[in-house]
Every structure is written in structure tokens, then in C-alpha cells.
Interface confidence: low
């Protein structure tokens, strides 16, 4: 009778094991082991027992002990089971961004590993098991479907293999894949709202605002604002699930015409875009031209108003005849025209909007000087010792200098409050002088003495 010890062995791949072959007869003709494995016999006293070291065990094997005794030949097998953990445990690559509500398929591939009967594949979200299946096939593949939710944002998905050799008196060997970190997002189907001027004047600044609600996570949203080829640099304000991107846009003469304004919101691997057209125009203020800005009384003056070729002008409220970009009027300058404003208003239609521009010029009329009865009475009669203020106003542009003298030396205190005395009486010569000339006027002051009874 041949026996073998141990009858069952589990060992790591490439490992060694000692196998003892024994026989029940004292003097066996033969005692040995049959195996393709490298073997080394350990010398022992006696004939009925042999110990062999079997090495580099790479796969399951069944070495067979045999003996030949007088009563016949017999054999006994030992079962060697090799274990090894998988060479590769990997989740199939996936885009890190996944839209909420989408079904996400996780696929884990496992290469190698034995014994397969003890090898299990586990798909996990964090530490929560999603699926557990025995490893079957080479490579073994396990899949599961996950409905993507908001609260998965930042969650780690992984695949773990478990080689459970605890029933064989060993341990549980685990291998885990690199985690796949899921980033979930919600990008609404509605395009972003874009608020901007429909028309924009050259060499001015406009404000563009792009906003969108219902985003998740709003912190990950990217906003791209552009006018034509000009990339805008917005200030982005984030809310709970919304953002508002505000940018200043400056345009030059090179941008004149119709430009495309774009707002694109990129979140995850999706984007939403809104397009709008902005008309960039050039419209200088109209020009008001006076023959001369300063003329003498009686001079003929031409006032012209000129504007953008496509504009329509009115000059002092009177539309150009025919309606167009030019208007003019003629006048003979009078003192009443001094300081008169000539206002030109130009209107230009740009992309259905009416744009208005104004320009005003003032006319200066030189006249005078003037001294007349109304503003400089020729006769004053005042009671003696009364308080009086002699008034005499000279008119003209420029404003004349006024002096009133009696006998060429004694001044009349114009505009000052005085106590009337006898020596105030007399005839004064008032002289108004300016660059435009000189006028004189006689003013008589009579002083009434009090009557004594």
C-alpha cells in the first residue's frame, strides 16, 4: 500500500513543497514519485519512506507516488493547487464628466489570478458594493450600469478582486484598480441668455451680460464670450446653480459693420451657445459752422449744419430742405442775437434704431455802446438829506465802461447809496466807452431844499 503526505497542498505560484512518499512493505523493490516538476530527494534512513522537494510549481499539478512491493504495485496522488493574484485589475476608461440622468456602464477587466473558483470581482462606488461576480474567462469581465446622479459628483468607482483562500487556511488577497472619479453635471437644454446693446458706436464701450440657470456644479462651468474674433474677459459671478458673466466691449473703426457676439457655456463635455448680432457704427456729432463766431451788429451771418452722409438734420428745430445731412440759415446780426444758440440735431438709423447727436454753437454780436432814457434817465430830482442810489446802465457788447462827471472832475457815484447834499446838484456828462466806440449823455441832478416855516 502506497501513501502520500500531504494529500492536498495550496501554494503560491513558483513556490516549493515537500512531498513524502511511503509504502507499507519493508523492502519495496521500487519507491518513487512521478511528476514533471523539478524534484530533489532528501536522504532519509530506511527503505519504505522518501521525501521529495518539488520546486517552481507554476500550475496545478498531481504528482504520483508509486511503490512496487512483493504483493504488487500501488500508487497515491497528491493534489497541488497554485494560487496567484491577478496581474491586471482595471476599469475601462470613461470620460470623467457624465451628465446627470445618463446610464453609465462600468466595465472591469481582470487578467490572470488563480484558483478561479476562489476569485471574485467586485465593482464598488466608494466602499459600497455595486456588483459581485465570480471571475470567469480570460480576461474576466464584470459590468454594471449606474444611473448618474448629482450626489455622485466626486465619487470614486473602482474594481476589486478578492482571492479568498481562508477555507484553505490562508488569507483573503485583495487587488484594487485605480479609481475612476466621476464628475457629474447638469447643463440645461436652454441656451444662455445674452443681453447686449444691438448697436454700438465706434470708440465707445458697451456692456455684455451672459447668464444661465440650472447648472450643476456651477463652479465647473466655463464661459466664453467673444465679439467677432475679439475674446472678451468677463467677470463671472456665481450663484447657487447659476452664473452671470459681465464683460466690457470696446470697438474701433476696424470693427465697423455687423459683428457676431457669442456666449458659450462649457460644462463637462457639453456646451450651449447663444449668438447675437451687434452693429458697430461710426456717427460723429454734427458740425455747426458760423461764418464767424463773433460779428458786429448788422453783419450777414451764415449758419451751416453738416452731419454723417446718411443722417437727417434739423437746425434750430427746422428740418433740412430737402431732408438730408445738411442745413443752413442766413441772418443779419442784431444785438438780440448776441449769445444766441444755433443747435443742430442729427438722426441716423442703425439696425432699426434711431441714434441722435446734437451740436450747439453760440453767436457773439458786438454792438453799442448805448445810453438811453430807460436805463439812464436824464433828470433826477431828490430831496436834500434823503438816501438815494443814482442809476445809469450802459449797454453793449463788450460791456462799456461808464463814468459820469460834473465839470470834468466831480463823479456821480453810480449804483452807490448816497446822502443827497447841495453839492450833488448839477449837470453830469455820462460817457460810455468800449472797443466798439463811445457815447455820451447829460444827466441833471436837482436837489430840493426843505422848507422852513
Amino acid at each position: 500500500q502506497t501513501s502520500v503526505s500531504p494529500s492536498k497542498v495550496i501554494l503560491p505560484r513558483g513556490g516549493s513543497v515537500l512531498v513524502t512518499c511511503s509504502t507499507s512493505c519493508d523492502q519495496p523493490k521500487l519507491l518513487g514519485i512521478e511528476t514533471p516538476l523539478p524534484k530533489k530527494e532528501l536522504l532519509l534512513p530506511g527503505n519504505n519512506r522518501k521525501v521529495y522537494e518539488l520546486s517552481n510549481v507554476q500550475e496545478d499539478s498531481q504528482p504520483m507516488c508509486y511503490s512496487n512491493c512483493p504483493d504488487g504495485q500501488s500508487t497515491a496522488k497528491t493534489f497541488l493547487t497554485v494560487y496567484w493574484t491577478p496581474e491586471r485589475v482595471e476599469l475601462a476608461p470613461l470620460p470623467s464628466w457624465q451628465p446627470v440622468g445618463k446610464n453609465l456602464t462600468l466595465r472591469c477587466q481582470v487578467e490572470g489570478g488563480a484558483p478561479r473558483a476562489n476569485l471574485t470581482v467586485v465593482l464598488l462606488r466608494g466602499e459600497k458594493e455595486l456588483k459581485r461576480e465570480p471571475a470567469v474567462g480570460e480576461p474576466a469581465e464584470v459590468t454594471t450600469t449606474v444611473l448618474v446622479r448629482r450626489d455622485h459628483h466626486g465619487a470614486n468607482f473602482s474594481c476589486r478582486t478578492e482571492l479568498d483562500l481562508r477555507p484553505q487556511g490562508l488569507e483573503l488577497f485583495e487587488n484594487t484598480s485605480a479609481p475612476y472619479q466621476l464628475q457629474t453635471f447638469v447643463l440645461p437644454a436652454t441656451p444662455p441668455q445674452l443681453v447686449s446693446p444691438r448697436v454700438l458706436e465706434v470708440d465707445t464701450q458697451g456692456t455684455v451680460v451672459c447668464s444661465l440657470d440650472g447648472l450643476f456644479p456651477v463652479s465647473e462651468a466655463q464661459v466664453h464670450l467673444a465679439l467677432g474674433d475679439q475674446r472678451l474677459n468677463p467677470t463671472v459671478t456665481y450663484g447657487n446653480d447659476s452664473f452671470s458673466a459681465k464683460a466690457s466691449v470696446s470697438v474701433t473703426a476696424e470693427d465697423e459693420g455687423t459683428q457676431r457676439l457669442t456666449c458659450a457655456v462649457i460644462l463637462g463635455n457639453q456646451s450651449q451657445e447663444t449668438l447675437q448680432t451687434v452693429t458697430i457704427y461710426s456717427f460723429p456729432a454734427p458740425n455747426v459752422i458760423l461764418t464767424k463766431p463773433e460779428v458786429s451788429e448788422g453783419t450777414e451771418v451764415t449758419v451751416k449744419c453738416e452731419a454723417h452722409p446718411r443722417a437727417k438734420v434739423t437746425l434750430n428745430g427746422v428740418p433740412a430742405q430737402p431732408l438730408g445731412p445738411r442745413a443752413q440759415l442766413l441772418l443779419k446780426a442784431t444785438p438780440e442775437d448776441n449769445g444766441r444758440s444755433f443747435s443742430c440735431s442729427a438722426t441716423l438709423e442703425v439696425a432699426g434704431q434711431l441714434i441722435h447727436k446734437n451740436q450747439t454753437r453760440e453767436l457773439r454780436v458786438l454792438y453799442g455802446p448805448r445810453l438811453d432814457e430807460r436805463d439812464c434817465p436824464g433828470n433826477w430830482t431828490w430831496p436834500e438829506n434823503s438816501q438815494q442810489t443814482p442809476m445809469c446802465q450802459a449797454w453793449g457788447n463788450p460791456l462799456p465802461e461808464l463814468k459820469c462827471l460834473k465839470d470834468g472832475t466831480f463823479p456821480l457815484p453810480i449804483g452807490e447809496s448816497v446822502t443827497v447834499t447841495r453839492d450833488l446838484e448839477g449837470t453830469y456828462l455820462c460817457r460810455a466807452r468800449s472797443t466798439q466806440g463811445e457815447v455820451t449823455r447829460k444827466v441833471t441832478v436837482n436837489v430840493l431844499s426843505p422848507r422852513y416855516e
Epitope: 470623467s96 462606488r125 466608494g126 466602499e127 459600497k128 446622479r149 448629482r150 450626489d151 455622485h152 459628483h153 466626486g154 465619487a155 470614486n156 472619479q181 464628475q183 450643476f216 456644479p217 463652479s219 465647473e220 447657487n240
Partner: antibody, heavy 119, light 111 residues
């Protein structure tokens, strides 16, 4: 508006357990996770862990495993934090906060629950 | 665990001053997706913390633009351009790139 209403202060004896609550309102409760944070004089602010309001999935700071248990009742929009085998070291203010699973910041916080462990 | 170190511990300021708070992490906070998940919170006396800035430089809803954040990797800064009375309190930085999430020790902004 978003609100996280926490249960009132607790004065308990050492060795017992306590369960504090955090009720969310003003938003879709299951769309967010609830994080728990401990504030103590000794350690400032410490993250205890996070629980998915939808699935009940949890991720604990290793330091609080065995001490803290997070649960959720989505029918009442309420998250719970249970602290076991209390000692004076557990005396602190505990906050719940709304956030994403792991990466996102905590955009809204509860008012805090003061826990005093004393014999 | 990632250790977050804030400085200074206390920051005395006058109203209208600029204030600057530094936060350093023991590991890079650059996530595999390229983002730095570094956030700033303000806790006023007797209140819960409130989110000011998330992901380094994004102001949260309702946070005035005098608050700004910058930095990448391991060095981050919070700046307040003109301190107002309502800004006083303890400022915390926090990271969520690595698990467990961790907080800085806090910087007290006081008059």
C-alpha cells in the same frame, strides 16, 4: 431659501450615545450630500464624513470610524449623526453642511449643535 | 492626511485696510482634472462658517468683490481689499482634493 436646521444642544454623561439631526429645506434634499464637521477648541474644524442623501452611501474620515455613524431619512429630508461611547473629547459643536460628494465646497451650513459630555 | 497651515494666526487691521491671509498645504491640491479644490470660509463669533470663495478664486453668491483668492498647488492667498466691520471673524481655508477633507487652523481678523 436653503436651510439646514439642526437639533438643540445636548448635555450627556460619558459612555452613552447621542444622535443629532439636520433637516434640510429650500432645495431638493436628495440632489446633495450632507457633510458633518466637528468644531473644538483643541482641533479647530475637522471633517467627520459625508453621506449621500439619496442612497445613504457614506465616506468617513478614518479618525471617526467607530465613533460616528451617519444615516439619512429621505422621507423627512433629515440626516443624522450618532456619536457612540462619548467622552469629554467629544464635547464640541457639530455642524452639518450641504455639499457635493467629495470635491465640492460646503455651500450651506446648519447653525450647529453643541454637545457637552460631562458627569 | 493633508495638513493645511494658515498664517498669521491673528491679523489686526484698521477699517479700510487691505488684509492678506496665507494658506499652505502639505501636498499639492491639483486634482487629476487640473483643478485646485481649495475653499475659504468665514466664521463670525457664535455663528456657523459661511462659504466665501470656492476653488481658489470663485466668490460664492452674495460675497462682495473686495474678497479675492489666488494660488495653485500648495500656496494660496485670500485678500480683502478694504476691510469693513462686517468682515471681522475667523477665516478658514479647506481642501477637498484629497480624502479626508481638511481645514486650516483659522486666522482671526480683528480691529
Amino acid at each position: 431659501q436653503v436651510q439646514l436646521q439642526q437639533s438643540g444642544p445636548e448635555l450627556v454623561r460619558p459612555g452613552v450615545s447621542v444622535k443629532i439631526s439636520c433637516k434640510g429645506s429650500g432645495y431638493t434634499f436628495i440632489d446633495y450630500a450632507i457633510h458633518w464637521v466637528k468644531e473644538s477648541h483643541a482641533k479647530s474644524l475637522e471633517w467627520i464624513g459625508v453621506i449621500s442623501a439619496y442612497s445613504g452611501d457614506t465616506n468617513y474620515n478614518q479618525k471617526f470610524k467607530g465613533k460616528a455613524t451617519m444615516t439619512v431619512d429621505k422621507s423627512s429630508n433629515t440626516a443624522y449623526l450618532e456619536l457612540a461611547r462619548l467622552t469629554s473629547e467629544d464635547s464640541a459643536i457639530y455642524y452639518c453642511a450641504r455639499g457635493g460628494w467629495l470635491l465640492l465646497s460646503f455651500d450651506y451650513w446648519g447653525q450647529g449643535t453643541t454637545l457637552t459630555v460631562s458627569s | 492626511d493633508v495638513v493645511m497651515t494658515q498664517s498669521p494666526l491673528s491679523l489686526p487691521v484698521s477699517l479700510g485696510d487691505q488684509a492678506s491671509i496665507s494658506c499652505r498645504s502639505s501636498q499639492s491640491l491639483v486634482h487629476s482634472n487640473g483643478n485646485n479644490y481649495l475653499h475659504w470660509y468665514l466664521q463670525k463669533s457664535g455663528q456657523a462658517p459661511k462659504l466665501l470663495i470656492y476653488k481658489v478664486s470663485n466668490r460664492f453668491s452674495g460675497v462682495p468683490d473686495r474678497f479675492s483668492g489666488s494660488g495653485s498647488g500648495t500656496d494660496f492667498t485670500l485678500k480683502i481689499s478694504r476691510v469693513e466691520a462686517e468682515d471681522l471673524g475667523v477665516y478658514f481655508c479647506s481642501q477637498s482634493t484629497h480624502v479626508p477633507l481638511t481645514f486650516g487652523g483659522g486666522t482671526k481678523l480683528e480691529i
